[in-house]
């Protein structure tokens, strides 16, 4: 039975041209993580093996960087990244467990206007 | 230089068993997912079975479940397909195949043909 | 399981050609898209991985693209030892499958 749970940074905004890290935690289960694939909609952006490593897919290598932990770090952002991200837990015996992330990337000054009035 | 060099193919009678080796060199074999592939006779590619680099996970094609074991032996960088219950619709060259993060397959050996005949 | 439907079954072109064939799966199956091109007689060897990214050692004459459903190879300049046989493969899940081939033959 899949008893774990996998926590997100959930819905998350970030000004053109900064960087940004997508994280998520599993968490509730004994299971071993053996991989976490990172998506973009229908793209694959990179992965993070046990053994391997992880490997960046070649077209978003000068944009993205591996980490911290299992995380990913997007730089150079456009409006463009805007939408939906996944990471994708494979584990033993659990099997596949999959978080989701939406990034707004918006125009400096929105991002900043924006920031005042979060609640903290 | 990565090498995956089958061995343990022939001609085997119908009901027949077969047990298929792949000894790998060049790289580090507890690392990476393999797999087998077979390709009948003229025909195209069909996935059998695949295998996590601790051999905790194991899958198989339907055509072969209950037929077919994989296993490794990591100490020996040996991959292994035990094959029961043969039928003529088995005969075929199997490749067993490297599989980096378990998404593609960038090493295959040279296949060693299974033939299945009475 | 996941279908995955190639076409065409075989083309005629000439050396300089450029040569499209597609790969259709029967769902969304992301980015997790291989080609591979065989020679008679021979193992397969990967191309393309992940719908776009180009193997290590692969003529850049070779390019992926798509996602979701619907996926293409294309050789931009054919060449005498492009003449071979290529298949799609999905990875998005087990049972991995293949196309059934698509053979590039000389005109």
């Known amino acids: 039975m899949m008893t774990g749970t996998i926590e997100t940074t959930g819905n998350i905004s970030a000004e053109k041209g900064g960087s940004i890290i997508l994280q998520c935690h599993l968490s509730s289960t004994t299971a071993q993580v053996t991989q976490v694939n990172w998506e973009q909609q229908d793209q694959l952006l990179a992965i993070c093996n046990a053994d391997l490593g992880w490997h960046i897919s070649p077209s978003f290598k000068d944009r993205v960087a591996p980490g911290p932990g299992l995380g990913l770090t997007l730089q150079s952002l456009t409006v463009n990244d805007t939408g939906e991200y996944f990471c994708i837990y494979h584990t033993y015996p659990d099997g596949t467990y999959t978080g989701r992330i939406f990034l707004e990337v918006l125009e400096s000054s929105v991002a900043e206007h924006g920031a005042r009035f979060q609640i903290p | 230089e990565v090498q995956l060099l089958e061995s343990g193919g022939g001609l085997v009678q119908p009901g027949g068993s077969l047990r298929l080796s792949c000894a790998a060199s060049g790289f580090t074999f507890s690392s990476y997912a393999m797999h087998w592939v077979r390709q009948a006779p003229g025909k195209g590619l069909e996935w059998v079975s695949g295998i996590s680099s601790n051999g905790g996970s194991t899958s198989y094609a339907d055509s072969v479940k209950g037929r077919f074991t994989i296993s490794r032996d990591n100490s020996k960088n040996t991959l292994y397909l035990q094959m029961n219950s043969l039928r003529a619709e088995d005969t075929a060259v199997y490749y067993c195949?490297?599989?980096?993060?378990?998404?593609?397959?960038?090493?295959w050996g040279q296949g060693t043909l299974v033939t299945v005949s009475s | 399981d996941i279908q995955m439907t190639q076409s065409p079954s075989s083309l005629s072109a000439s050396v300089g050609d450029r040569v499209t064939i597609t790969c259709r799966a029967s769902q969304s199956i992301s980015s997790y898209l291989n080609w591979y091109q065989q020679k008679p007689g021979k193992a397969p060897k990967l191309l393309i991985y992940?719908?776009?990214s180009l193997q290590s050692g692969v003529p850049s004459r070779f390019s992926g693209s798509g996602s979701g459903t619907d996926f293409t190879l294309t050789i931009s300049s054919l060449q005498p030892e492009d003449f071979a046989t290529y298949y799609c493969?999905?990875?998005?899940?087990?049972?991995?499958?293949f196309g059934g081939g698509t053979k590039v033959e000389i005109k």
């Open positions: 493969q999905q990875s998005y899940s087990t049972p991995l499958t």
């Open positions: 992940a719908a776009s």
């Open positions: 195949a490297r599989v980096p993060y378990g998404v593609w397959i960038d090493y």
